[in-house]
């Protein structure tokens, strides 16, 4: 699977993580920081 960084217009899309673009699937994906989950790394897990 080819992966690139998301374009700059996606800055802030991932609240607690890094935005990556899955080229083959044409989908953006957030790689969350440790302790976070959710589509946009929006949830801290207790």
């Amino acid at each position: 699977v080819q992966i690139t960084k998301c374009s700059s217009d996606m800055d802030g899309y991932c609240l607690h993580g890094q935005c990556i673009y899955l080229v083959d699937m044409r989908e953006k994906f957030c790689r969350c920081e440790v302790g976070y989950t959710g589509l946009r790394c929006e949830h801290f897990f207790l």
């Epitope: 609240l15 607690h16 899955l22 699937m25 989908e27 994906f29 989950t37 959710g38 589509l39 946009r40 929006e42 949830h43 801290f44 897990f45 207790l46």
Partner: antibody, heavy 118, light 112 residues
């Protein structure tokens, strides 16, 4: 309009498994979480977990890890919940509910009653 | 997990009265965005829960203005200014800030 249509009631034996469904319509299926909520007869609501349909991400309430397994079929815009090793404690209504990122449960399914009995 | 404690368990009211339900979280449910994802739902017998209030004080579309939500940090309140027959049922608070999400135990609003 957004609709979540759940499968019908299930009567299952202890130790067995059951798979219930929640068919979504009226919105883009891959644009919201499908959550599942348990309600034992006469009792309160318990949150089981959520699944984001694409790319698939799941999160389970630790209490339900190993009991519930959430999956989706994107082609039919349907979410599923498999409940395994059933006991009488699993007899309950199960609701699916749609939730966008950091948004409330604005839409709910009608509920599926699962009865576990020998 | 965040424990959501609702009081009272049962609330007998006369039609036209004001009703107040309290919900307390065991820890702060303020999100890193600064928002508080505290919601209120009403479940009538034999029905699915229905959204009333989200983000502490925002009424969902179609919800009458006699319903209001308030609070901050760990203490939240749902008020119904003039109770009508259609308001009877079980009210649940809910937090969606951290995972796992949790519901309060419910408050049954019933006729005195």
């Amino acid at each position: 309009q957004v609709q979540l249509q759940q499968s019908g009631p299930e009567l299952v034996k202890p130790g067995a498994s059951v798979k219930i469904s929640c068919k979504a319509s009226g919105y883009t299926f891959t644009d919201a979480y499908i959550n599942w909520v348990k309600q034992r007869p006469g009792q309160g609501l318990e949150w089981i977990g959520w699944i984001w349909p694409g790319p698939v991400i799941t999160y389970y309430n630790p209490k339900f890890k190993g009991k519930a397994t959430l999956t989706v079929d994107k082609s039919s815009s349907t979410a599923y919940m498999l409940l395994s090793s059933l006991t009488s404690e699993d007899s309950a209504f199960y609701f699916c509910a749609r939730r966008e990122v950091l948004s409330p449960f604005a839409y709910w399914g009608q509920g599926t009653l699962v009865t576990v009995s020998a | 997990d965040v424990l959501m404690t609702q009081t009272p368990l049962s609330l007998p009211v006369s039609l036209g009265d004001q009703a107040s339900i309290s919900c307390r979280s065991s820890q702060s449910i303020v999100h890193s965005t600064g928002n508080t994802y505290l919601e209120w739902y009403l479940q009538k017998p034999g029905q699915s829960p229905k959204l009333l209030i989200y983000k502490v004080s925002n009424r969902f579309s179609g919800v009458p203005d006699r319903f209001s939500g308030s609070g901050s940090g760990t203490d939240f309140t749902l008020k119904i200014s003039r109770v009508e027959a259609e308001d009877l049922g079980v009210y649940y608070c809910f937090h969606g800030t951290h995972v796992p999400y949790t519901f309060g135990g419910g408050t049954k609003l019933e006729i005195k």
